[in-house]
Amino acid sequence: ITGISPITEYLASLSTYNDQSITFALEDESYEIYVEDLKKDEKKDKVLLSYYESQHPSNESGDGVDGKMLMVTLSPTKDFWLHANNKEHSVELHKCEKPLPDQAFFVLHNMHSNCVSFECKTDPGVFIGVKDNHLALIKVDSSENLCTENILFKLSET
């Protein structure tokens, strides 16, 4: 069960492991998401990250232990949130009202130095990643691949 209100919020720019910026552009009344190199003094787009505490049930391994996870939603502009489209393996911006659908929630991973990863709440093992200069959903098969650079992101206040 995910908490109704976030435990904290954080306004940050989002960049890839290789320091490319995630940008959002309004095109034909819908938002497009790009992964690109910005010019030296170009302003980075900011994203509002809302963090929710979530209890996750004991898993199939038989531990019988409940634990906590940190869920996050990402909103680059008012009333728009990043959504996982699992059918299309795509990441999209959707306008919606609260309560947000599960597709807007991502499990936060930050066990790789100071990078973060975003795992789909609706599809465990599938992460937001970079593919062909766009964000996409990427299936991560083995534990070793959790450190693969294309699913690692950096958060920065600047």
Epitope: I7, T8, Y10, Y51, E53, H56, N59, S61, D63, V65, G67, K68, M69, L70, V107, L108, H109, N110, M111, H112, S113, N114, E119, S143, E144, N145, L146, C147, E157
Partner: antibody
């Protein structure tokens, strides 16, 4: 029962190495990072580093870089911390510690081992 | 590395007193601050996480507040079992760093 069980106290000579073990039980081992924190007698807490049991990646505090090695054995749910080139200032209680949230250290550290006293003396 | 400045380093108080401990960070850490209690010979115990969230099982007399660089731990009515050392810790970035500690002693 969720717990971390650490190896026993060690006495080492300066220049030697020490390897402390920490066996986890009662939870999904690979879903939580494992941190090592030390505390010298009468002093505060000092973070040494973290290992991600999922893939084995590590992050070490600059102070210990080159002297510390953290490893894990997923088959036994055990994490190891080896500190080399010991000096008297390394005399401390060494704790393994698990964050309260899976996959993240943002929500603090809620599960601690009892600590292993390492004494470095000639 | 983010520096943590905790004050006071010690405080003498009586049972029933209100005790306030502050922690200042060298750069903004959003709300990613935790507070711990440690008694002699024991491991630290998590009291507060995300600046103001009370860890399960911790009495409600403990509360935390703040964001950015300035944070506070308050014990509203000190109990005999609260005499201990308290540490703040930032969880925003690695390396994780701790404050120097505040020893709460019996007056």
């Amino acid at each position: 029962q969720v717990q971390l069980v650490q190896s026993g106290a060690e006495v080492k000579k300066p220049g030697a190495s020490v390897k402390v073990s920490c066996k986890a039980s009662g939870y999904t081992f690979i879903s939580y990072g494992m941190h090592w924190v030390r505390q010298a007698p009468g002093q505060g807490l000092e973070w040494m580093g973290e290992i991600n049991p999922h893939g084995g990646s590590t992050s070490y505090a600059q102070k210990f870089q080159g002297r510390v090695t953290m490893t894990r054995d997923t088959s036994t749910s055990t994490v190891y911390m080896e500190l080399s080139s010991l000096r008297s200032e390394d005399t401390a209680v060494y704790y393994c510690a698990r964050p309260s949230a899976a996959y993240s250290h943002y929500l603090g550290i809620d599960l601690w081992g009892r600590g292993t006293l390492v004494t470095v003396s000639s | 590395d983010i520096q943590m400045t905790q004050s006071p380093s010690s405080v003498s108080a009586s049972v029933g007193d209100r005790v306030t401990i502050t922690c200042r960070t060298s750069q903004g850490i959003s709300s990613w601050l935790s507070w711990y209690q440690q008694k002699p010979g024991k491991a630290p115990k998590l009291l507060i996480y995300a600046a103001s969230s009370l860890q399960s099982g911790v009495p409600s007399r403990f509360s935390g507040s703040g964001s950015g660089t300035d944070f506070t731990l308050t014990i509203s009515s000190l109990q005999p079992e609260d005499f201990a050392t308290y540490y703040c810790q930032q969880a925003h970035v690695l390396p994780l760093t701790f404050g120097g500690g505040t020893k709460v002693e019996i007056k």
